[in-house]
Amino acid sequence: MKVLQEPTCVSDYMSISTCEWKMGGPTNCSAELRLLYQLVFQSSETHTCVPENNGGVGCVCHLLMDDVVSMDNYTLDLWAGQQLLWKGSFKPSEHVKPRAPGNLTVHTNVSDTVLLTWSNPYPPDNYLYNDLTYAVNIWNENDLADSRIHNVTYLKPTLRIPASTLKSGISYRARVRAWAQHYNTTWSEWSPSTKWYNSYREPFEQR
């Protein structure tokens, strides 16, 4: 049994790190493999993650590590029974992928403005809470070429766009993702998309 692609891990900097790797051939990850992880600290336990399949030769493990801080470092050991396949380490603060924003809502009750709001995926006491910026993707359901990205570089999880910048009588979808500049993170996954109908009509004298 051989590891084809070594484990790579990303942390949500809250409670979960996700590690993925590829084996040299088809593998029943949960039956054959175990990923052991331990915080490098004198009295820490070694926890065991039972991996799940991620494609024919791919495996994925979710490591539980509440209260992540910047100096935390974990040792990782990938075992197949009594055989050590790979040994490595992982510093969560250096490989952060934020959680996806949630509760994306579109408010169209103000006639000439579309207001999008969403929730910050972190609690206020988390280091990432005040460091997130967002990208909002809006697209025309009937014309995928009619798609745009709005960068939200302020802290408030809201975006206002003039309804007049969107085509009238068309259904649009939006989704949002996040990243944290000071932690040099990757982008989060996109939030689930939400749909609305743009019923805005230009005033008569502008037609």
Epitope: S15, I16, S30, R34, L36, S43, E45, T46, H47, T48, C49, V50, E52, H62, L63, L64, M65, D66, D67, Q82
Partner: antibody, heavy 129, light 109 residues
Amino acid sequence: EVQLVESGGGLVQPGGSLRLSCAASGFSSSSAHYMCWVRQAPGKGLEWIGCIYAGSRGSTYYASWAKGRFTISRDNSKNTVYLQMNSLRAEDTAVYYCARAAFVNRGVSWIWPYYFSLWGQGTLVTVSS
Amino acid sequence: IQMTQSPSSLSARVGDRVTITCQASEDIESYLAWYQQKPGKAPKLLIYRASTLAYGVPSRFSGSGSGRDFTLTISSLQPEDFATYYCLGSSYSTGSNIFGTGTKVTVLG
């Protein structure tokens, strides 16, 4: 220093109740591990009672014999774990230990405690009339 | 699960090699730990995951086995090793953590 300190033991009458406390210091009781209770009757072996996950998921597991009469809870703000014991019997007389445990997890919702690494000094519970 | 530990007691001299065994009633992979307990004290973790030495434990202690059969070996018994030893088996399939009945190691003679 990383340590666990149990308290609340003492003499209780059969049929009575008692709540034991386990105060953690030197580490956060809300970090990723289990907090467990183990007991030892005088001159006898060790017996697992149950565990509570100390992280954000708070799941509990109990030995089959302990379900119903024994309840484990936690107060992360006080870094303390509790063992509530009801309908006590003479055979519950034992030293009760608090212990921190490692776990096995599959995904993020299935987490099982599997060895006890750090132990408290124990507190004696005597059930007698 | 049930954990059958043997022997229940043994007598040995300083310098002796001591072996204690534990058998699980079902396959528990490597989810087995060994503990040392002295009178009036809390148990102390020696070995976890069947063969991994816990932090600060002398290298004369070793563990082996997987599945159902496990062994704790003390390669050269020291005066401070006279104590009771327990195995702990964990089965997440049946949802139990079960200790063995213990092995009391005493001074011969």
